[in-house]
């Protein structure tokens, strides 16, 4: 399973779609900016074996899919772009699931570092809480879109590090 190669392509497509989804100027939402505390240390790529890296990436993509599959998201974004973005996320999730199956030879590899998974989950809980507090306003969604783009870009660096390790 060529995880970094497969995933980097999907990641790039997802980033392009996220960029296209922008509807309002980020400059008009500067007052709504927020630090969500992206768990950068979980993506430094040094302490991970491949199976654990797969599971952290899957967590991030699944949580992103959950976030953009809500009714409030559907009411905010242009439908065809949102559907393309969701389809891309789903394809990445399927690819990562298949990677675990292909890793069957390294059977004893633990699938996760619980702390890393929880850090990603809590990061998305903070994003959801922010949206709720801001009553899912257009600016709040714009801030979240920019944040997800940033987190995808950071995870892309993580994947490239993984590729070098391989």
């Amino acid at each position: 399973c060529d995880l970094p190669q497969t995933h980097s392509l999907g990641n790039r497509r997802a980033l392009i779609l996220l960029a296209q989804m922008g509807r309002i100027s980020p400059f008009s939402c500067l007052k709504d900016r927020h630090d969500f505390g992206f768990p950068q240390e979980e993506f430094d790529g040094n302490q991970f074996q491949k199976a654990q890296a797969i599971s952290v990436l899957h967590e991030m993509i699944q949580q992103t899919f959950n976030l953009f599959s809500t009714k409030d998201s559907s009411a905010t974004w242009e439908q065809s772009l949102l559907e393309k973005f969701s389809t891309e996320l789903n394809q990445q999730l399927n690819d990562l699931e298949a990677c675990v199956i292909q890793e069957v030879g390294v059977e004893e590899t633990p699938l996760m570092n619980v702390d890393s998974i929880l850090a990603v989950k809590k990061y998305f809980q903070r994003i959801t809480l922010y949206l709720t507090e801001k009553k899912y306003s257009p600016c709040a969604w714009e801030v979240v879109r920019a944040e997800i783009m940033r987190s995808f870009s950071l995870s892309k660096i993580f994947q490239e590090r993984l590729r070098r390790k391989e």
């Epitope: 899957h58 967590e59 599959s69 399927n94 675990v100 199956i101 059977e107 996760m112 998974i117 929880l118």
Partner: antibody, heavy 126, light 110 residues
Framework: EVQLLESGAEVKRPGSSVRVSCRAS????????ISWVRQAPGQGLEWMGR????????NYAQNFRGRITITADKSPLTAYLELSSLRFEDTAVYYC???????????????????WGQGSLVTVSS | EIVLTQSPGTLSLSPGEGATLSCRAS???????LTWYQQKPGQSPRLLIY???SRATGVPDRFSGGGSGTDFTLTISRLEPEDFAVFYC???????????FGQGTKVEIK
């Protein structure tokens, strides 16, 4: 916690079709698949197929292709199973089942069934 | 297509005894994608063990899962009266997604 509520029992003639519904409530996400699993009287469990409600993407077990259609509504989150050309051996309890968003890590979430409906008995009889 | 074979078909035991249930796959299965369920008469199945060895919420620690490759086991250290039921193993394979169940092992009171 997710609750799955299925439609009531049905009696059908051979050759006809049946449609069973499954309404999800609680901590639901349309980004997780809903599956249909059946159990013939005194027999084991058999996976039939699944749908990802967010996208309408379906996957069907080989045994049922050509006879099965799974659809879903996103609001309220409801999955439907339609089975056509019914035979006597299709008499079974039909369950809808879904994963849990609380399973850690999420990569295991969609590989299992954490929540099950109460089951809907479909009897095929002439 | 993967076939899961469970053995024995029926296990007759007394409360307090231990039980070991086997699930054998026709080809390699990732232990991460091996799940066990318990089903009592007239009830829907209940998730017991996932990821090969992780207990689902509320499952007592007398239940444990193990194994890898093609051979997996569910162990019940000391049977309680409420444990008597049918147990199913299930595997997942992708792509495309396919869920496969074993035929079940019935654990009955001797």
């Amino acid at each position: 916690e997710v609750q799955l509520l299925e439609s009531g029992a049905e009696v059908k003639r051979p050759g006809s079709s049946v449609r069973v519904s499954c309404r999800a409530s609680g901590d639901t996400f349309s980004s997780y698949p809903i599956s249909w699993v059946r159990q013939a009287p005194g027999q084991g469990l058999e996976w039939m197929g699944r749908i990802l409600p967010a996208l309408g993407v379906t996957n069907y077990a080989q045994n049922f292709r050509g006879r099965i259609t799974i659809t879903a509504d996103k609001s309220p989150l409801t999955a439907y199973l339609e089975l056509s050309s019914l035979r006597f051996e299709d008499t079974a309890v039909y369950y809808c089942a879904s994963p849990s968003a609380d399973i850690i890590p999420s990569i295991l979430g969609t590989t299992l069934f954490a929540f099950w409906g109460q089951g809907s008995l479909v009897t095929v009889s002439s | 297509e993967i076939v899961l074979t469970q053995s024995p078909g029926t296990l007759s035991l007394s409360p307090g005894e231990g039980a070991t249930l086997s699930c054998r796959a026709s080809q390699n299965v990732s232990r991460h994608y091996l799940t066990w369920y318990q089903q009592k008469p007239g009830q829907s199945p209940r998730l017991l063990i996932y990821g090969g060895s992780s207990r689902a919420t509320g499952v007592p620690d007398r239940f444990s899962g193990g194994g890898s490759g093609t051979d997996f086991t569910l162990t019940i250290s000391r049977l309680e009266p409420e444990d008597f039921a049918v147990f199913y193993c299930q595997s997942y394979h992708s792509p495309p997604p396919v869920y496969t169940f074993g035929q079940g092992t019935k654990v009955e009171i001797k």
